[in-house]
Interface confidence: medium
């Protein structure tokens, strides 16, 4: 199916930035993988390069305001040809769940005190209001609540005096129309405006002001135009050569306003002065490798020695990663394809241990499915041998880190029954619907 | 051990509207998602319909979309298909399939097959024109 692409994909936003155009297959537009398309407009955007997996969205906000509840977030697999880790296609959505709590109390409505006194008119003439008051201790609210109502009321007084009304001028009229719209008539135009006293009105019992300045006012037309032209579009111009050598480009033809050119005010000509096209030069653009991961440490050995596991003998170990990815004459992936350290080995030796904190509570599993729990560990954690933390293996290449490596056998005195792991669980609260944002939006 | 068995298939006439179930024992119907897919004589298998473990949300094929309804009823362990404006090109075996990861969601996820642990054996629907 044709889609809509794009040149360039926003990794912060997730959105698709400047379009080249569309009717154009997903396997053209990702000749360049650092095109990105859309199936529809306003719809998903996927970025040509390999699939990986976004950012994860900001916490959605808690399901509850006050207590405990819980709130979701969630991250997209976005890429087009193969898979996010977990064999997870484009387009899926993975999602956490927590737990949360706003507010620990939940608000408590107060009470009205009773009325207090009536304040004086709020005029000394004519009708106005007064007030009184009332305060919200009777009792107090709690935990941000309120009391039910209003805090004043109000109602009508009459002073039983008129009031003088003062003249106020109502807005200008517009202006007269000049006699000529072009310059060069035979009179010079001029223009004139008018204002009425009667907003409102002085009274004459009691007597009111009346309204300062004059009632009209007149000026010349100054800068009346010459007449316009309107200006016409010139032929369209060559096409301009296709500006990439990669993937899908876009050329562009221009044509000038100047058949002819508008003058004295007169109108530009309309439409566009330029209009582009879409190139295809059927070359796929160069790919650059990238680091896989690390691989595992390789166990720690030493030369010559059939184990130093429990000893105090440092070894050496290695790990190696991929460049994968390269292609089409790309850049090859930089920095070292090997890393080597100093070790000593642990792996399967007896340590003495003890019992960690607790951990902080994990996250509430599963995040979409029913009954999400979370739950919080206490391991029995080894207590490492104090051997020197640097060594010097080759005379005069100074001294070396020397990491502790392999999976011991930690013993601690039994807690709960347990000898490695305590665990505890809870259920998650008010658990919120994983949906997806892009459906929400139509 | 773990039984998903479908029913309601038969031959229709073309624009005629037929209703397949799909009945789940041996596993916690309530925690999964479930799927209808099809497959047509010497075609691959298609995706249809899908339809989350709560049921608030629904997926359909855009070949199947506004005619067909799915839907489940977590009390009686299982899932429906509603077919109406039946045409020709709708025959095919259906099969109904069960999702247990509840960490994933989106069309993109649902309508790839691998993705489900448990498949019925299918029901025959044929239309007539």
């Known amino acids: 199916d044709p889609v809509l692409c794009f040149t360039q994909y926003e990794e912060s936003s997730g959105k698709c930035k400047g379009l080249l155009g569309g009717g154009v297959s997903v396997e053209d537009c990702c000749l360049n993988t650092a095109f990105a398309y859309q199936k529809r407009s306003g719809g998903l955007c996927q970025p040509c390069r390999s699939p990986r997996w976004s950012l994860w969205s900001t916490w959605a906000p808690c399901s509850v305001t006050c207590s405990e509840g819980s709130q979701l977030r969630y991250r997209r697999c976005v890429g087009w040809n193969g898979q996010c880790s977990g064999k997870v296609a484009p387009g899926t959505l993975e999602w956490q769940l927590q737990a949360c709590e706003d507010q620990q109390c939940c608000p408590e409505m107060g009470g009205w005190s009773g009325w207090g006194p009536w304040e004086p008119c709020s005029v000394t003439c004519s009708k106005g209001t007064r007030t009184r008051r009332r305060a919200c201790n009777h009792p107090a609210p709690k935990c941000g609540g309120h009391c039910p109502g209003q805090a004043q009321e109000s109602e009508a007084c009459d002073t039983q005096q008129v009031c003088p009304t003062h003249g106020a001028w109502a807005t200008w009229g517009p202006w007269t129309p000049c006699s000529a719209s072009c310059h060069g008539g035979p009179h010079e135009p001029k223009e004139t405006r008018s204002r009425k006293c009667s907003a409102p009105e002085p009274s004459q019992k009691p007597p009111g002001k009346p309204c300062p300045g004059l009632a009209y006012e007149q000026r010349r037309c100054t800068g009346l135009p010459p007449c316009p032209v309107a200006g016409g579009w010139g032929p369209w111009g060559p096409v301009s050569p296709c500006p990439v050598t990669c993937g899908l480009g876009q050329t562009m033809e221009q044509r000038t306003c100047n058949h002819p050119v508008p003058q004295h005010g007169g109108p530009f000509c309309a439409g566009d002065a330029t209009r582009t096209h879409i190139c295809n030069t059927a070359v796929p653009c160069p790919v650059d490798g990238e680091w896989d991961s690390w691989g595992e440490w390789s166990p720690c050995i030493r030369r010559n020695m059939k184990s130093i596991s429990c000893q105090e003998i440092p070894g050496q170990q290695s790990r190696g990663r991929t460049c994968r990815g390269r292609k089409f004459d790309g850049h090859r992936c930089a920095g070292q394809q090997q890393d080597i350290r100093h070790c000593y080995s642990i792996q399967h030796c007896p340590l003495k241990g003890s019992w960690s904190e607790w951990s902080t509570w994990g996250l509430c599993m599963p995040p979409c499915g029913p009954n999400p729990t979370r739950a919080r560990q206490r391991l029995c954690t080894p207590l490492l041998p104090k051997y020197p933390p640097t060594v010097s293996m080759v005379e005069g290449q100074g001294e070396k880190n020397v990491t502790f490596w392999g999976r011991p056998l930690p013993r601690c005195e039994e807690l709960q029954g347990q000898k490695l792991v305590v665990e505890e669980k809870r259920p998650c609260l008010h658990v919120p619907a994983c949906k997806d944002p892009e459906e929400e939006e139509l | 051990q773990v039984q998903l068995v479908e029913s309601g298939g038969g031959l229709v006439q073309a624009g005629d509207s037929l209703r397949l179930s799909c009945a789940a024992s041996g596993f916690t119907f309530s925690s999964y998602a479930m799927g209808w897919f099809r497959q047509a004589p010497g075609k691959e298998r298609e995706f249809v319909a899908a339809i989350t473990w709560s049921g608030v949300s629904t997926y359909y094929a855009d070949s199947v979309k506004g005619r067909f309804t799915i839907s489940r009823d977590n009390a009686k362990n299982r899932v429906y298909l509603q077919m109406n404006s039946l045409k020709p090109e709708d025959t095919a075996v259906y099969s109904c399939?069960?999702?247990?990861?509840?960490?994933?969601?989106?069309?993109?996820?649902?309508?790839?097959?691998?993705?489900?642990?448990?498949w019925g054996q299918g029901t025959q629907v044929t239309v007539s024109s």
């Open positions: 399939a069960a999702d247990g990861s509840g960490r994933y969601s989106g069309m993109e996820y649902y309508n790839r097959d691998w993705v489900y642990d448990y």
